[in-house]
Interface confidence: low
């Protein structure tokens, strides 16, 4: 069965496409401008919001703007968007967001009765994900994304774990092959880390990186295939 996403750029409208397609047809037309805002660091950016998680839009005086890796704690910054999840820009330096700001909330999207001041029209909008008036009603749990506050790893979306970041806990990405990891020397030593890392992804283990070009004293650990 066919659902066609035809572009209005291509000269054929979704309706025309539907007429010649057999079965089910979902016409999904792109906008008429090729200057739409797209995603990913391969593209120039105009704001931080166009970059992937953990990146910000760097606009040099000369050359094109691009999504750059976020700045960590104590690094220089000009705005909040430059700082990594769990930190914010204060007096030109990325500092940790306070615990109170990162406290998890019960998810909700409430409806409110709002009066339009210009026209005096009342609108009673029930746009809620839940009804707060019924505390025992079943509530959907919003899974945390990168940098979101959490209590345990089940609070985070797949591919992320709940790890300590200063004195709070946020969702961080599970480590992939070749990424630096933390080898646990003693059981429960995770509790001592201010910047806790996630474990390696399934099928990987945290092993010493045996590389002649790297100092043996450093004993860098990376995620490697079991």
């Amino acid at each position: 069965k066919l659902n066609s996403i035809k572009s209005s750029l291509g000269g054929e409208t979704p309706a025309q496409s539907a007429n010649r397609s057999a079965g089910m047809n979902q016409g999904l037309a792109f906008g008429g401008s090729k200057k739409g805002k797209s995603l990913g660091q391969a593209y120039p950016c105009s704001s931080d919001k166009e970059c992937e998680v953990g990146r910000y839009c760097h606009s040099p005086h000369q050359g094109s703007s691009a999504c750059m890796l976020c700045r960590r704690k104590k690094k220089r910054c000009h705005r909040d968007g430059m700082c990594c999840p769990g930190t914010r820009c204060n007096n030109g330096i990325c500092i940790p967001v306070t615990e109170s700001i990162l406290t998890p909330h019960i998810p909700a999207l409430d409806g409110t009765r709002h009066r339009d001041r210009n026209h005096g029209h009342y609108s009673n909008h029930d746009l809620g994900w839940q009804n707060l008036g019924r505390p025992h009603s079943k509530m959907p749990h919003i899974k945390g994304h990168e940098g979101d506050p959490c209590l345990r790893s089940s609070d985070c979306i797949d591919g992320f774990c709940c790890a300590r970041h200063f004195w709070t806990k946020i969702c961080k990405p599970v480590l992939h092959q070749g990424e630096v990891c933390t080898k646990q020397r003693k059981k429960g030593s995770h509790g001592l880390e201010i910047f806790q890392r996630c474990d390696c992804a399934k099928g990987l283990s945290c092993k010493v990186w045996k590389d002649a070009t790297y100092s043996s004293k450093a004993r860098l650990h990376v995620c490697q295939k079991i």
């Epitope: 037309a29 792109f30 805002k37 391969a42 166009e50 998680v53 998810p107 990168e146």
Partner: antibody, heavy 115, light 104 residues
């Protein structure tokens, strides 16, 4: 909920969010006419109120936010029968990477424009 | 929207074709999402990045495809799957949805 709006009298829809960092995610507004598909109106980023509107709605919809109450608003100007629809607010889903998919939706408000 | 009558247990396939690639070469992700909307309810995200199932979505919903051709498969349709299904490109603004497929 349901709303009856007089033609020409603007209406402001509100969408209150909690349970996540309101200023980190785009908030989308989507229109659905009876028995029809979904139409993206636009989105606003609460951090700085940057707005991206579907050109079709540039003279129809005005998106605003109130960071202090974690509430997004959409005002529809000079409503006509063509604006009779269900309007949803929907959160941008970060989903690990920056993405414009929508992972949480409001329950929708049915707006009927009639005299 | 087009509709399709199905029986419980049957395999359902819906396709979505784009005239522009939705593949982001920098991360090899296809920015195509699928939503389910039951009568009188809000849409629900089923699949994003073409094949990643949203948390809590039954594994009978399988998204596939790359570039311009995408498919949502329900491997064994259940009575509760009767709904409208929409595809959406979540790559570039303005965001756009498919016209929808009604599963009856």
């Amino acid at each position: 909920g349901a709303e009856l709006v007089r033609p020409g009298a603007s209406v402001k829809l509100s969408c209150k969010a909690s349970g996540y960092s309101f200023t980190n995610y785009w908030m989308n507004w989507v229109k659905q006419r009876p028995g029809q598909g979904l139409e993206w109106i636009g989105m606003i980023h609460p951090s700085d109120s940057e707005t991206r509107l579907n050109q079709k709605f540039k003279d129809k919809a005005t998106l605003t936010v109130d960071k202090s109450s974690s509430t997004a608003y959409m005002q529809l100007s000079s409503p006509t029968s063509e604006d009779s629809a269900v309007y949803y607010c929907a959160r941008e889903g970060r989903l690990g990477l920056r993405s414009y998919a929508m992972d949480y939706w409001g329950q929708g408000t049915s707006v009927t424009v009639s005299s | 929207p087009s509709s399709l009558a199905m029986s419980v247990g049957q395999k359902v396939t819906m396709s979505c074709k784009s005239s522009q690639s939705l593949l982001n070469s920098s991360n090899q992700k296809n920015y195509l999402a699928w939503y389910q909307q039951k009568p009188g309810q809000s849409p629900k995200l089923l699949v994003y990045f073409a094949s990643t199932r949203e948390s809590g979505v039954p594994d009978r919903f399988v998204g596939s495809g790359s570039g311009t051709d995408f498919t949502l498969t329900i491997t064994s349709v259940q009575a509760e799957d009767l709904a409208d299904y929409f595809c959406q490109q979540h790559y570039i603004t303005p965001l756009t949805f498919g016209a929808g497929t009604k599963l009856e």
